[in-house]
C-alpha cells in the first residue's frame, strides 16, 4: 500500500481542504473510526487500485487516525494496513469528545492503561490530574493516544491551555473489577410443577463482576427463547444472579436446565444443571408400608409416622374412629407434617402418655385438588400385666386350691411354679413348673375374659393341689409382650395348724 502524503503524522489547517490518496495492487479503502467515509475508488489501466479521500472544511473534530486497508483482505497479508494521524489545531475544540466506553476504564489486573484524552494541536501542553485536583501527575503523554501508565481506582481529568483559556477534559473513571474463578450454583423455586404453573430458576455466581450467563433449556431447542433477568439482590457485592422464568409451563418443558457462566477476562467458565419435571396434574403417593395393626404401650408416648410424596403441597388430616383429630390443648396429642424434601412429607401423630381410651381405628388422609390418599390402622394399647389376686383355699373335697387373677394387653400367659424346700428356694433350687396335665398332683383351670371398656384381658387361673404333705411355695407369674408380674403364696398341709 502507498499513501500520499506518507505521514505518519500530518498537521492541517482548520477550514482547509485536504486530499489523501491510497493505492495498492488490490482494491483499497480508507477507514475512519471503524467506518468508511465517502471516497472515490478507481482502477488504473496498469491494474493499480486507488482510493481518494477528500477532507473538506476541516475542523478539530477531524483530528484522529485514518487507515488505508485492502477492501478484501482474502489471500493478502492481514497486517497490510497503513495508519496516518491527522491533527487539525482548532481553538474552538478543546479535548476531542469521548464516548461512554472510553470514559469508564475497567481493569481486571494491575496493568498499563491509557486515559484517552486527546487534543487537536500537537503543540499543546497537556497535564493529567485527579478529578478536582490541581497537582499534575507525572505520567507520560502521547498527543495521539493520551496518558499511559498504571493508575489507581480513581477519577482523572486532563487539562490544557488554549490561548489564555484553561480547558478540562471529561472525567475518566478507572475501576478495577473483581475477577476470580467461577463457581456456579443453580436452584429452582420448584423442580416439580404442574402444567400451567411457572418455572423459575436461579443461577448464582459469586466473586466476579464480569460474567455472562447462558441458559440452555428444553424450550430453547424448539426455538422458543426466554429472556433471563440478571439481578444483584444478595447481601454482598458480586453475588450475581440470573433468573430464568418460564410462565405457564407445558409438559414439553420437562428436562434439563443448564446455566453456563463465562468470564471473558481469564476465560473461566462453569456450568450447573438441574432437572425440572412438569406433571399433567398433581399427585399424592404413599412411600413404604405401615402395618394395619399398630401398638402403643400404656402411659408411654408413641409416635406414628407416615411418609408420602405429593405435589402440590397437600392438606393432611388425621381421624380416630372417623372423628377429626387436632392438637389437644392438654398436650395429649400432637400432629405435625413436615416437608423433608421438595415433594416428600412426613406426617406424625404423637400420643403423649398413652391412655387406654386412645386405642381405636386411625386414618391419615392427605389430599389436594388433584389427588388424595389415605392410610388406616388399628391402634392397640398394650398394658403391662399385673397380678391382682393370688389366694389359697381348702375346699371340703380335701384338695387345696390356689386362685390367680390378673390383667393385661395383649392377653397374658400364666405360669404356675412351686418350690418344696423353702430354705433353699428359689435361690438354690429352681421352682418346678406346675399344671402339667400328666401329673396327678395338680390340675389347672384357666378362664380368659376380654373387657371391652378397659380394652384388656383378664385371666383367672385355678390350681388344684391333690396332696400337700409339707409347706409349699406356689408362685403365679403373668407374662405378656410388655412385661411380667409375679406373686407367691405358701400352701401348708391340712394337718398343720398354721399357714403363712
Amino acid at each position: 500500500l502507498v499513501v500520499t502524503p506518507p505521514g505518519p503524522e500530518l498537521v492541517l489547517n482548520v477550514s482547509s481542504t485536504f486530499v489523501l490518496t491510497c493505492s495498492g495492487s488490490a482494491p483499497v479503502v480508507w477507514e475512519r473510526m471503524s467506518q468508511e467515509p465517502p471516497q472515490e475508488m478507481a482502477k488504473a489501466q496498469d491494474g493499480t487500485f486507488s482510493s481518494v479521500l477528500t477532507l473538506t472544511n476541516l475542523t478539530g473534530l477531524d483530528t484522529g487516525e485514518y487507515f488505508c486497508t485492502h477492501n478484501d483482505s482474502r489471500g493478502l497479508e492481514t497486517d497490510e494496513r497503513k495508519r496516518l494521524y491527522i491533527f487539525v489545531p482548532d481553538p474552538t475544540v478543546g479535548f476531542l469528545p469521548n464516548d461512554a466506553e472510553e470514559l469508564f476504564i475497567f481493569l481486571t489486573e494491575i496493568t498499563e492503561i491509557t486515559i484517552p484524552c486527546r487534543v487537536t494541536d500537537p503543540q499543546l501542553v497537556v497535564t493529567l490530574h485527579e478529578k478536582k485536583g490541581d497537582v499534575a501527575l507525572p505520567v507520560p503523554y502521547d498527543h495521539q493516544r493520551g496518558f499511559s501508565g498504571i493508575f489507581e481506582d480513581r477519577s482523572y481529568i486532563c487539562k490544557t491551555t488554549i490561548g489564555d483559556r484553561e480547558v478540562d477534559s471529561d472525567a475518566y473513571y478507572v475501576y478495577r473489577l473483581q475477577v476470580s474463578s467461577i463457581n456456579v450454583s443453580v436452584n429452582a423455586v420448584q423442580t416439580v410443577v404442574r402444567q400451567g404453573e411457572n418455572i423459575t430458576l436461579m443461577c448464582i455466581v459469586i466473586g466476579n463482576e464480569v460474567v455472562n450467563f447462558e441458559w440452555t433449556y428444553p424450550r430453547k431447542e424448539s426455538g422458543r427463547l426466554v429472556e433471563p433477568v440478571t439481578d444483584f439482590l444478595l447481601d454482598m457485592p458480586y453475588h450475581i444472579r440470573s433468573i430464568l422464568h418460564i410462565p405457564s409451563a407445558e409438559l414439553e418443558d420437562s428436562g434439563t436446565y443448564t446455566c453456563n457462566v463465562t468470564e471473558s477476562v481469564n476465560d473461566h467458565q462453569d456450568e450447573k444443571a438441574i432437572n425440572i419435571t412438569v406433571v399433567e396434574s398433581g399427585y399424592v403417593r404413599l412411600l413404604g408400608e405401615v402395618g394395619t395393626l399398630q401398638f402403643a404401650e400404656l402411659h408411654r408416648s408413641r409416635t406414628l409416622q407416615v411418609v408420602f410424596e405429593a405435589y402440590p403441597p397437600p392438606t393432611v388430616l388425621w381421624f380416630k374412629d372417623n372423628r377429626t383429630l387436632g392438637d389437644s390443648s392438654a398436650g395429649e396429642i400432637a400432629l405435625s407434617t413436615r416437608n423433608v424434601s421438595e415433594t416428600r412429607y412426613v406426617s406424625e401423630l404423637t400420643l403423649v402418655r398413652v391412655k387406654v381410651a386412645e386405642a381405636g381405628h386411625y386414618t391419615m388422609r392427605a389430599f389436594h385438588e388433584d389427588a388424595e390418599v389415605q392410610l388406616s390402622f388399628q391402634l392397640q394399647i398394650n398394658v403391662p400385666v399385673r397380678v391382682l389376686e393370688l389366694s389359697e383355699s381348702h375346699p371340703d373335697s380335701g384338695e387345696q386350691t390356689v386362685r390367680c387373677r390378673g390383667r393385661g394387653m395383649p392377653q397374658p400367659n400364666i405360669i404356675w411354679s412351686a418350690c418344696r424346700d423353702l430354705k433353699r428356694c428359689p435361690r438354690e433350687l429352681p421352682p418346678t413348673l406346675l399344671g402339667n396335665s400328666s401329673e396327678e398332683e395338680s390340675q389347672l383351670e384357666t378362664n380368659v375374659t376380654y373387657w371391652e371398656e378397659e380394652q384388656e384381658f383378664e385371666v383367672v387361673s385355678t390350681l388344684r393341689l391333690q396332696h400337700v404333705d409339707r409347706p409349699l411355695s406356689v408362685r403365679c407369674t403373668l407374662r405378656n409382650a410388655v412385661g411380667q408380674d409375679t406373686q407367691e403364696v405358701i400352701v401348708v398341709p391340712h394337718s398343720l395348724p398354721f399357714k403363712v
Partner: antibody, heavy 127, light 107 residues
Framework: EVQLVQSGGSLVQPGGSLRLSCTAS????????MSWVRQAPGKGLEWVAN????????YYVDSVKGRFSISRDNAKKSLYLQMNSLRAEDTAVYFC????????????????????WGQGTLVTVSS | AIRMTQSPSTLSASVGDRVTITCRAS??????LAWYQQKPGKAPNLLIY???SLESGVPSRFSGSGSGTEFTLTISGLQPDDFATYYC?????????FGQGTKLEIK
C-alpha cells in the same frame, strides 16, 4: 468548566403544562446518562426520571409516569422535562444531574452516582 | 420500589466529633449506593459512590462502608463546613431512590 444551567421553572395552574430545560457545557454531553431530581419545599430529594445517551432507554418514578416525558438533544447539549397534567404535589425545585452509568460489563452494571448538578429551578403548581 | 431509610433524621454534634449516619435498603442493592451532601438553597454534592469510593475533591474525613442492605457514612473530625443535610441514594435497574435525609446540626 463542567456545568449544567437550568431554565423553565415558573408558576403554573393545576392541570397545566411546563417544559424544563438543562444545558450542558464543559463535557461531552452525548456520552452520559442524565437525570431529573426534584425537592418539594422543606422535603427530601426525589428522583423523577432518567435517560440513556441515545434516548433508547427512559425511566420514570411511578408518580409521574404518563404525565412527564424526558428527552434530550445531544447536538444542542440539552436535556428536557416536559411536564403535563401538573398537580399541586409536583411543586418542587427541579434539578438536572449528570448520571454516571458506565456501559455494562458482561451482565453486571456499575453506578458512580450523580456528580454534576444544575442550580435548580422552582416549579409551583397552584391555582 | 426499593425503599431507603436513613437514621437518625436529625443529628446534633460538635466540631471535631466523629459521626455516623446509617442507611438501610428494603432489599439488597449490592454496593450500588451513593451519599450526597446538601446545603440550604444549593444543589446536592456527591461525596461517595459504590458505597465506599470517595469522590474526587471530597475530604478524606468522609468515608462510606457497607453492602447488601446496610450502609454507613462516617465523618471523622467534623468541620464547621460539614453541617448540612446528607442523603443516601440507591441505583437499581436504572431507577433511583433517595433516603429521607439526615440533618446534621451544631450541638
Amino acid at each position: 468548566e463542567v456545568q449544567l444551567v437550568q431554565s423553565g421553572g415558573s408558576l403554573v395552574q393545576p392541570g397545566g403544562s411546563l417544559r424544563l430545560s438543562c444545558t450542558a457545557s464543559g463535557f461531552t454531553f452525548s456520552s452520559y446518562w442524565m437525570s431529573w431530581v426534584r425537592q418539594a419545599p422543606g422535603k427530601g430529594l426525589e428522583w423523577v426520571a432518567n435517560i440513556q445517551q441515545d434516548e433508547s432507554e427512559k425511566y420514570y418514578v411511578d408518580s409521574v409516569k404518563g404525565r412527564f416525558s424526558i428527552s434530550r438533544d445531544n447536538a444542542k447539549k440539552s436535556l428536557y422535562l416536559q411536564m403535563n397534567s401538573l398537580r399541586a404535589e409536583d411543586t418542587a425545585v427541579y434539578f438536572c444531574a449528570r448520571d454516571l452509568v458506565p456501559p455494562r460489563q458482561g451482565d453486571y452494571y456499575h453506578y458512580f452516582g450523580m456528580d454534576v448538578w444544575g442550580q435548580g429551578t422552582l416549579v409551583t403548581v397552584s391555582s | 420500589a426499593i425503599r431507603m431509610t436513613q437514621s437518625p433524621s436529625t443529628l446534633s454534634a460538635s466540631v471535631g466529633d466523629r459521626v455516623t449516619i446509617t442507611c438501610r435498603a428494603s432489599q439488597s442493592i449490592s454496593d450500588w449506593l451513593a451519599w450526597y451532601q446538601q446545603k440550604p438553597g444549593k444543589a446536592p454534592n456527591l461525596l461517595i459512590y459504590k458505597a465506599s469510593s470517595l469522590e474526587s475533591g471530597v475530604p478524606s474525613r468522609f468515608s462510606g462502608s457497607g453492602s447488601g442492605t446496610e450502609f454507613t457514612l462516617t465523618i471523622s473530625g467534623l468541620q464547621p463546613d460539614d453541617f448540612a443535610t446528607y442523603y443516601c441514594q440507591q441505583y437499581n435497574s436504572y431507577s433511583r431512590t433517595f433516603g429521607q435525609g439526615t440533618k446534621l446540626e451544631i450541638k
